[in-house]
């Protein structure tokens, strides 16, 4: 009687387990054929690649930029895999010799044949931006702008790509694309969650990151404030990106680039200097240089304080003091007279900061060779080490830096003020808010700056609405299927077990 | 579209000062300079002066130097030309028109009609 | 001052037919390959026009029967074919120079 009974629970155990095993394995069979098959496209991979120039005021860039074609609406796909500095000056310095211009262009024009294969040449399109320097060249002279555009645009079409045309873009789009990049970058127009991060500076939340971008000749800054409402319209973006919609303030304050912000400086000193000598703090201590009074008017950006000299020529001799050159960079911002509520400087509308930013080109440049990107380091200690760059002497500073060029090198006093000038009383960050400025050079191998995100516009890689993309996060798909897999991998071990040795397995079940 | 609207026509007596105001819109105000061009009736376009909208600075015609002031109100998109010390032959239509070196745009005139 | 000089002082064309005005600068108007020559329309009670810029450029939206040649000093409007519209006062001006400065102006009419 006790030998049937442990036969019949034998038998039903048996029947069970094999029951429930069969099941697992059937549904993980099916798992991982319904996450394979819906995650994968049974397509080769077909790299696509675009080229954007920026065409600055102090010099040229190249961008190579390449994606996977069937992830064209995906988020963070992009991504840059050359840049390519010109050999020279900005564009808007080529006014006087434009049949120079083919030159110019062709070793960085040349570097992107190379790399991007011939195969795809026709259908690479490349676009060039001109910014602040060709605004300022247009401003003078609409004639002369057209002039260099259409040299320029004439040297590009002579390549084997698809060139899309050549354009001063507003300060507006500088700043708008400026802050697509890195928010683009940083993956902050992903809806999904993230278990995890490889990207610096991200923090889990989808706020995105203001930008702040400094040029020679203009400087931006760009963020989505808390206040939706806007009292200057001419600031106010929207746009709807992956289904999801961004109120942006942005604004370019042409003329406060570093390149031209010291020539202001250097008009605005120079009409109360006695003789045509210019004791400037700006400078280091020994250092001496001569400046054309045309040279100082050619900008419009010194207009405003032009006046009849009774000397052609002034030399600099730097004294090196921070706290005088700060006072002096702080006479360049008008903050007496606001219209709004709040403004930056020079009656301009600035609504109140919100969030983090990523400041990069000559923000991240500069405050990198004065080894002060660091997050670790408080606006107090920035202050303390400026004061201490700038006074070092010129002739100590040259040994130093001896591989950095002496025109540059000069300069980092008076941009280093200049920036922490332009953060702290322009734009309004305090002590406090300056660990909310992130310095980026570049976002997991893309530079940050303009140039992506008009890329991104202009070839419609940023849809309005959330793309019907892979369900599933490569991070979840892997780890679905290794779960799925490792059911599958036990099923069939205890399947084993059970019908190879069923004594060893029932031993104990009486 | 670029638009520039000027303010209403103006009777002034010898001696007075006028103020001529030039709306911009349709582009960035601070993009492009702004020139004043004034024709009194019969006569040839003359060219007064510009201001650098971005920072107020300006550049005049001798003939006027002294008698004319060029500002703006970059909040409100606004030039304005002022005339001083105003004379019968001062009587004409005075333009606003945007441009570095070339005047593409132009507003509809103001009459101003110097008369004692 | 670049003094301009425009000639005719007036023109008579029958409808159809080609109208030349003629502006000379007092100097050269040419500047790093630019010629800083633009030409205008001014019908009565409206604001100039503009044509022709940098000598031979045309302005948005002018017809093609409007042409512009010349550099240095020497510079010429051609309306290829008149039209009852095209009367007018045409005004050459220079910008390569502070003070800007205008041609005396040409007066079309139809013959």
């Known amino acids: 009687m006790e030998d049937t009974k442990e036969s019949n629970v034998k038998t039903f155990c048996s029947k069970n387990i094999l029951a429930i095993l069969g099941f697992s394995s059937i549904i993980a069979v099916i798992a991982l054929l319904a996450v394979g098959l819906t995650q994968n496209k049974a397509l080769p991979e077909n790299i696509k690649y675009g080229i954007v120039l920026d065409a600055g005021s102090s010099h040229t860039s190249l961008y190579i930029y390449k994606w996977p074609a069937e992830k064209e609406n995906d988020t963070g796909v992009v991504h840059q895999v050359e840049e390519c500095r010109v050999k020279g000056p900005g564009i808007s310095k080529y006014v006087q010799k434009v049949n120079e211009i083919g030159i110019y262009l062709t070793d960085c024009m040349e570097r992107a044949r190379e790399v991007i294969p011939r195969s795809q040449h026709q259908e690479t399109p490349v676009y060039l931006g001109a910014t602040a320097g060709m605004r300022l060249l247009r401003m003078e002279s609409e004639e002369l702008a057209d002039r260099v555009l259409d040299v320029v645009e004439r040297s590009l079409s002579n390549y084997p790509f698809d060139f899309q045309g050549a354009r001063i873009i507003t300060g507006q789009e500088e700043g708008a694309y400026g802050w697509i990049t890195i928010n683009y970058l940083l993956g902050k127009f992903s809806q999904k969650t993230r278990w995890f991060s490889i990207v610096p500076y991200e923090t889990n939340n989808q706020e995105t990151f203001g930008a702040l971008d400094l040029g020679g000749a203009s400087t931006q800054i760009t963020f989505v404030p808390q206040n939706q409402t806007t009292e200057s319209p001419d600031n106010a973006l929207q746009f709807r990106l992956y289904g999801k919609d961004y109120n942006v303030y942005t604004h370019s304050f042409l003329c406060y680039g570093k390149d031209q912000a010291l020539w202001q400086k250097l008009a605005k000193d120079i009409q109360v200097a006695s003789n045509e000598i210019l004791r400037d703090p700006c400078f280091h201590p020994g250092y001496k240089k001569v400046v054309n009074v045309s040279d100082l008017y050619k900008t419009p950006c010194t207009k405003r304080f032009e006046m009849t000299l009774p000397f052609q020529q002034f030399e600099i001799q730097g004294i090196g003091n921070y706290q005088q050159c700060h006072q002096s960079v702080l006479e360049l911002f008008n903050t007496s007279y606001c219209p709004y509520s709040q403004c930056a400087f020079n009656g301009i509308f600035l609504p109140p900061l919100q969030g983090d930013f990523g400041a990069f080109s000559a923000f991240y440049f500069v405050m990198n060779f004065l080894n002060l990107t660091s997050e670790k380091v408080s606006q107090e200690k920035v202050t303390e080490m400026m004061k201490k760059f700038c006074s070092q002497p010129w002739e100590e500073i040259k040994t130093s830096y001896a591989g950095v060029k002496e025109k540059y090198l000069s300069e980092y006093c008076f941009s280093g003020t200049y920036i922490l000038s332009l953060l702290l009383q322009g734009y309004h960050f305090t002590a406090d808010s300056w660990e909310h400025i992130h310095f980026i050079g570049k976002i997991q191998g893309s530079d940050a700056g303009w140039t992506l995100g008009y890329m991104l516009n202009l070839t419609n890689m940023i849809p309005a609405e959330q793309p019907l993309s892979t369900p599933l996060s490569h991070s979840t798909y892997v780890f679905l299927m290794v779960l799925f897999s490792l059911v599958l991998v036990i099923v069939a071990i205890i399947g084993l077990l059970i019908f190879h040795k069923p004594s060893y397995f029932w031993k104990d079940m009486v | 579209q670029v638009q520039l609207v000027q303010s209403g026509a103006e009777v002034k007596k010898p001696g007075a000062s006028v103020k001529v105001s030039c709306k911009a819109s349709?582009?960035?105000?601070?993009?492009?300079?702004m020139h004043w061009v004034r024709q009194a009736p019969g006569q040839r376009l003359e060219w007064m002066g510009y201001i650098v909208p971005l920072n107020g600075g300006s550049t005049f015609n001798q003939k006027f130097k002294g008698r004319v002031t060029i500002t703006r109100d970059t909040s409100a998109s606004t030039a304005y030309m002022e005339l001083s010390s105003l004379r019968s032959e001062d009587t004409a239509v005075y333009y606003c028109?945007?441009?570095?070196?070339?005047?593409?745009?132009w507003g509809q005139g103001t009459l101003v009609t110097v008369s004692s | 001052d670049i003094v301009m000089t425009q000639s005719p002082d007036s023109l008579a064309v029958s409808l159809g037919e080609r109208a030349t005005i003629n502006c000379r600068a007092s100097e050269s108007v040419d500047n790093f390959g630019v010629s800083f020559m633009y030409w205008y329309q001014q019908k009565p009670g409206q604001p100039p026009k503009l044509l022709i810029y940098?000598?031979?450029n045309q302005g948005s939206g002018v017809p093609d029967r409007f042409s512009g040649s010349g550099s240095g000093t020497d510079f010429t409007l051609t309306i290829s074919s008149l039209q009852a519209e095209d009367v007018a006062v045409y005004y050459c001006q220079q910008t390569k120079e502070v003070p800007y400065t205008f041609g005396g102006g040409t007066k079309v009419e139809i013959k």
């Open positions: 028109a945007r441009g570095g070196t070339r005047f593409a745009y």
């Open positions: 940098g000598a031979s």
């Open positions: 349709g582009y960035t105000f601070t993009d492009y300079n």
